[in-house]
Interface confidence: low
């Protein structure tokens, strides 16, 4: 559901990742969008504590920019997804091993909740930066 509004990020988890002046998309399908999205990030962030030093910063950037997407504040506020190329770089370059483990756990049903699924984008479904430079966010 892409109904929501733009607001400055005022959470804590993604403070170091998101630009200070960034407007993020808050999804009104949640009763309290700020709190719900922050909880999503927080839950997924804890999983990242065990990943490699190479993967972690890339994964954190992907995670924060996926859950707190950049917001285009027109008449109808619109979330701007991450560019496919950046998502693939994290998946196949920085975090290849960790991504495989996560996908395997998902298929085997080892996650207790579906919360992590919301925090991991499907790279193939994201727009390419080469189609329309304004259609996606560059990390």
């Amino acid at each position: 559901d892409n109904k929501g509004y733009c607001a400055q990020y005022r959470g804590e988890v993604c403070n170091a990742v998101l630009a200070k002046d960034a407007l993020v998309f808050l999804n009104t399908s949640y009763a309290d969008p700020e709190e719900a999205q922050e909880l999503l990030v927080h839950t997924a962030w804890n999983e990242l504590k065990v990943v490699s030093p190479v993967c972690r910063p890339a994964a954190e950037a992907l995670l924060c920019n996926h859950i707190f997407q950049e917001c285009s504040p027109g008449v109808v506020p619109t979330p701007i997804p991450i560019c496919r190329e950046y998502c693939l770089a994290v998946k196949e370059l920085f975090c290849a091993k960790e991504w495989l483990v996560m996908e395997e756990k998902t298929h085997r049903g080892l996650y207790r909740s579906e919360m992590h699924l919301l925090s991991v984008p499907e790279c193939s479904k994201l727009p390419s930066m080469h189609w329309d430079p304004t259609a996606c966010a560059r990390l």
Partner: antibody, heavy 118, light 112 residues
Framework: QVQLQESGPGLVKPSETLSLTCTVS????????WTWIRQPAGKGLEWIGR???????DYNPSLKSRVTMSVDTSKNQFSLKLSSVTAADTAVYYC????????????WGQGTMVTVSS | DIVMTQSPLSLPVTPGEPASISCRSS???????????LDWYLQKPGQSPQLLIY???NRASGVPDRFSGSGSGTDFTLKISRVEAEDVGIYYC?????????FGQGTKLEIK
Amino acid sequence: QVQLQESGPGLVKPSETLSLTCTVSGGSISSYYWTWIRQPAGKGLEWIGRIYTSGSTDYNPSLKSRVTMSVDTSKNQFSLKLSSVTAADTAVYYCARYNWNDDAFDIWGQGTMVTVSS
Amino acid sequence: DIVMTQSPLSLPVTPGEPASISCRSSQSLLHRNGYNYLDWYLQKPGQSPQLLIYLGSNRASGVPDRFSGSGSGTDFTLKISRVEAEDVGIYYCMQALQIPHTFGQGTKLEIK
């Protein structure tokens, strides 16, 4: 050091449009909200609205139907237009920078007096 | 809109003495991130307003340490530990939590 300078006509006729420009010098206009605030003589401060460098705007609901703001990043300027003015719009108009880090207006222009009179 | 109410509206003070200004908001300015979105400004005679305190209690760059901000939620206070002649002017509180940002009516500090 960033400085702001308002410019525009000091006298506007009733029912006409007030137009002001704020020039940002000593730094970039990018990545900030830029704001207009006014102060009628001997009275308090009223927030008119703000514009982000992307061009997105937020206006005070009390003035929304009459206000238009724009930004020209190439010139490091942003502008205010207030239509259908009356004597009640006579005030000192300030431009100011809204600093995300402080959540406050950390830099102000010196203000420009605009009188609405025939 | 959030309504900001200041008191007193006029404050005569003897140099060297302390001064205190109160500001109340019609709804809480405490965000769940722990910050109070309340700023204080001073407008000296013939000048533009200048930032004194941001986010309730943080002194802006260059502001003397005799100025301090306190409070949380809906009740806030600006204190000047020892008033100096250069402190004269009108003090405004402003809420930065919601659009439109709104100011208090102002408190005029004058030297006795």
